[in-house]
Amino acid sequence: MGWIRGRRSRHSWEMSEFHNYNLDLKKSDFSTRWQKQRCPVVKSKCRENASPFFFCCFIAVAMGIRFIIMVTIWSAVFLNSLFNQEVQIPLTESYCGPCPKNWICYKNNCYQFFDESKNWYESQASCMSQNASLLKVYSKEDQDLLKLVKSYHWMGLVHIPTNGSWQWEDGSILSPNLLTIIEMQKGDCALYASSFKGYIENCSTPNTYICMQRTV
Amino acid sequence: MGWIRGRRSRHSWEMSEFHNYNLDLKKSDFSTRWQKQRCPVVKSKCRENASPFFFCCFIAVAMGIRFIIMVTIWSAVFLNSLFNQEVQIPLTESYCGPCPKNWICYKNNCYQFFDESKNWYESQASCMSQNASLLKVYSKEDQDLLKLVKSYHWMGLVHIPTNGSWQWEDGSILSPNLLTIIEMQKGDCALYASSFKGYIENCSTPNTYICMQRTV
Amino acid sequence: TTPGERSSLPAFYPGTSGSCSGCGSLSLPLLAGLVAADAVASLLIVGAVFLCARPRRSPAQEDGKVYINMPGRG
Amino acid sequence: TTPGERSSLPAFYPGTSGSCSGCGSLSLPLLAGLVAADAVASLLIVGAVFLCARPRRSPAQEDGKVYINMPGRG
Amino acid sequence: TTPGERSSLPAFYPGTSGSCSGCGSLSLPLLAGLVAADAVASLLIVGAVFLCARPRRSPAQEDGKVYINMPGRG
Amino acid sequence: TTPGERSSLPAFYPGTSGSCSGCGSLSLPLLAGLVAADAVASLLIVGAVFLCARPRRSPAQEDGKVYINMPGRG
């Protein structure tokens, strides 16, 4: 189906302008057949007859409203993330992690303290089985919770006799001034003790241990 | 504008069936004017001419597809929340919190250890200013990270001389066997020390303190 | 001095910690508003369909038939 | 007076401040998929508009004009 | 031999595992409500399309052909 | 024994912990992208409606009136 369209004539008798003729179907037909249209430029009672143009405009307006609403809401979500104004403390509340279930999360790092005593290798294997490593100390600022840890726990620091350095499981060298290394026994592994102290211990000695996952 | 419609006549000369007449406008006009319509029941080349009926069906199908897609995706989100199968360790990895920025999060509780020494009242006020409380010990299981805390820190436990009991800031009585309370000095306030010990101290004595937010 | 010397301990926990019952950003009220707004928007569109498509019969259009070149029927 | 003399300590933890029961849930891949799917669905609808509304000119309709009762133009 | 004899320790932390500035929020009941609301809204729209677009044939329109200039059939 | 007695330390971190690489997933960049995507999709639909529905008047159609049975004007 299409539009019935002619061209203008100077012979008025030969043509009839459709000023008064109503070319609509029954309204029920119209409503079912002419949804979401735009009214063509025809002088007819568009508004009265639920013109497709008016209808289409309505849809467009509705979509525009939806757009405005959604943008407003998402902007609110966005701004709420940016400046969480619900909390009085600086820089909002936030989630920490992800971490294995029931691990400690601090500054987006995950820590777990294990009570069972194992040697260094077993401790490392235990951490690995949980997609983690033995504790790596990389920043006094980011890991300041460690200063409050009591007792001694295996960490992921091993001695490299060939060059005398201490290195972490990931191969990185221990940064100066991060840990104070103290010899407890002759050995190539290190226990973490409070206030950023490391105690040299024989790797086969059983001790509790700290596992860590870095998430940032 | 409307549909041009008549009724059937037995006078074939007087009427012309529109079998072969194409009543479409220029295609551009059609495409812009007749969006999202349903084709009326007229024998015409509907598919060929992008019938409104076909178009409307297409829209409905598209909306249906959107419905299916969105339900599928939200179901995936929902199921992922229910059984987070992405992680190999028991019961998934999870986020912890929400907590104030840079607080320790453990089992959805938030903790912060403050270095500055304050008396009990100042410590309590400091925690309150951060929408938190002084440490409340309510479960050895949920708060087992506390067993590793070294040193002494104010917690939210106060002595009620009238009945000799110890109660938390929220008015709840200290449960038996949660803390072992030991007198360090005569007083009505308590310091938390490692392994779930509480030390009685004069409330005006300056000490470091632990703030806590419960999120569950 | 002891705690007793204070007439009362300071009022505590005036509100929940950051409200945010489960997120900093997508708090419950926000999510509820989001769903509601989307629902309202969708209903607006559906409403528009019904509202605009409602038949408004003009007086001359009694029978829903179309007559062409019938000026007398104007 | 001592703390004990207070009839009750102020109410504490009046409400929870979050449960996060199953965060992680909205992981990056999932959210990306969600946005992409919604985008695709929207584009499908827009595409449908253009696709369905595309004019397919029949051979006899050369000029886009409509002639009525012109059998010779059949 | 000691660890030093290994040319390199295994690669560690190859990628990040998330930053999470705001999650949880989508708890199970909330997600369920969200899914339901989206489903209902979508179905409403789809339903409206089909409902409104349902053809209502008038009795005289048996054959779907259009006749013009048939005043006697008015 | 010392660490050296192990030929190599076991391979570590085979994958990120729990994928969810960036929960909070609703991080700022992600949220921004989400808003943008929704905005673009909505604008596309709105734009399509207006664009497609824009009247394109042909030169002869000055007044919006329809003339029928004017073969001479063919």
Epitope: - | K140, G164, W166, L174, P176, N177, L178, L179, T180, I181, I182, E183, M184, Q185, K186, S195, F196, K197, Y199, I200, N202 | - | - | - | -
Partner: antibody, heavy 121, light 108 residues
Framework: EVQLLESGGGLVQPGGSLRLSCAAS????????MTWVRQAPGKGLEWVSI????????FYADSVKGRFTISRDNSRNTLYLQMDSLRAEDTAVYYC??????????????WGQGTLVTVSS | SYVLTQPPSVSVAPGQTARITCGGN??????VHWYQQKAGQAPVLVVY???DRPSGIPERFSGSNSGNTATLTISRVEAGDEADYYC???????????FGGGTKLTVL
């Protein structure tokens, strides 16, 4: 009425071991800390060890640390003191006592009658 | 570790007031408890938390504590009060219970 009854004392050689028991009744045993105090013949009271109600916390006098172990069985309302590597100076009457405050280590409100341990060759 | 010092003995006539002291560094900041032990018997708590009395203990027994000295006061002393008296505190720094050496009260 609170009752505490010690048992298990006797004569033992230096380096030997002995296990003392204290049966408690008349109170909720599991929420009170319990202690062992000894008194050498003609001497004053000397604290030996204390255990919290849950058994989580144990404290020892320096003179017995590493040799004595305090424990409790809350299901049986019984307190124990395992004494190893006994020395002559461990000879004393051993009293079991109940803490006076249920969440606090403070004072000893109730005492048993004591059991005599003699370490001699 | 913390040390409590008591006089080995105190003598008092019946009906008089006996004062038994217990000295310790800043003992006034600690809660002091007092036990009575009669010959051949187990100790009995007579005063706790400096000055509180358990039920069944006569009002004649009272306590005070300030500075570096805690005092157990027995007024209107009776012959039956003759016993050894021990002071006790908790040393929170070392997690030890500390007893004084004991004071033998003799009723003349």
């Amino acid at each position: 009425e609170v009752q505490l009854l010690e048992s298990g004392g006797g004569l033992v050689q230096p380096g030997g071991s002995l296990r003392l028991s204290c049966a408690a009744s008349g109170f909720t045993f599991s929420i009170y800390a319990m202690t062992w105090v000894r008194q050498a013949p003609g001497k004053g009271l000397e604290w030996v060890s204390i255990i919290s109600g849950s058994g989580d916390h144990t404290f020892y006098a320096d003179s017995v640390k590493g040799r004595f172990t305090i424990s409790r069985d809350n299901s049986r309302n019984t307190l124990y003191l395992q004494m190893d590597s006994l020395r002559a100076e461990d000879t004393a009457v051993y009293y079991c006592a109940k803490e006076g405050k249920w969440v606090q280590l403070s004072h000893f409100a109730n005492w048993g009658q004591g059991t005599l341990v003699t370490v001699s060759s | 570790s913390y040390v409590l010092t008591q006089p080995p003995s105190v003598s008092v006539a019946p009906g008089q007031t006996a004062r038994i002291t217990c000295g310790g560094n800043n003992i006034g900041s600690k809660s002091v408890h007092w036990y009575q032990q009669k010959a051949g018997q187990a100790p009995v708590l007579v005063v706790y938390d400096d000055s509180d009395r358990p039920s069944g203990i006569p009002e004649r027994f009272s306590g005070s504590n300030s500075g570096n000295t805690a005092t157990l006061t027995i007024s209107r002393v009776e012959a039956g009060d003759e016993a050894d008296y021990y002071c006790q505190v908790w040393d929170g720094r070392s997690d030890h219970v500390v007893f004084g050496g004991g004071t033998k009260l003799t009723v003349l």
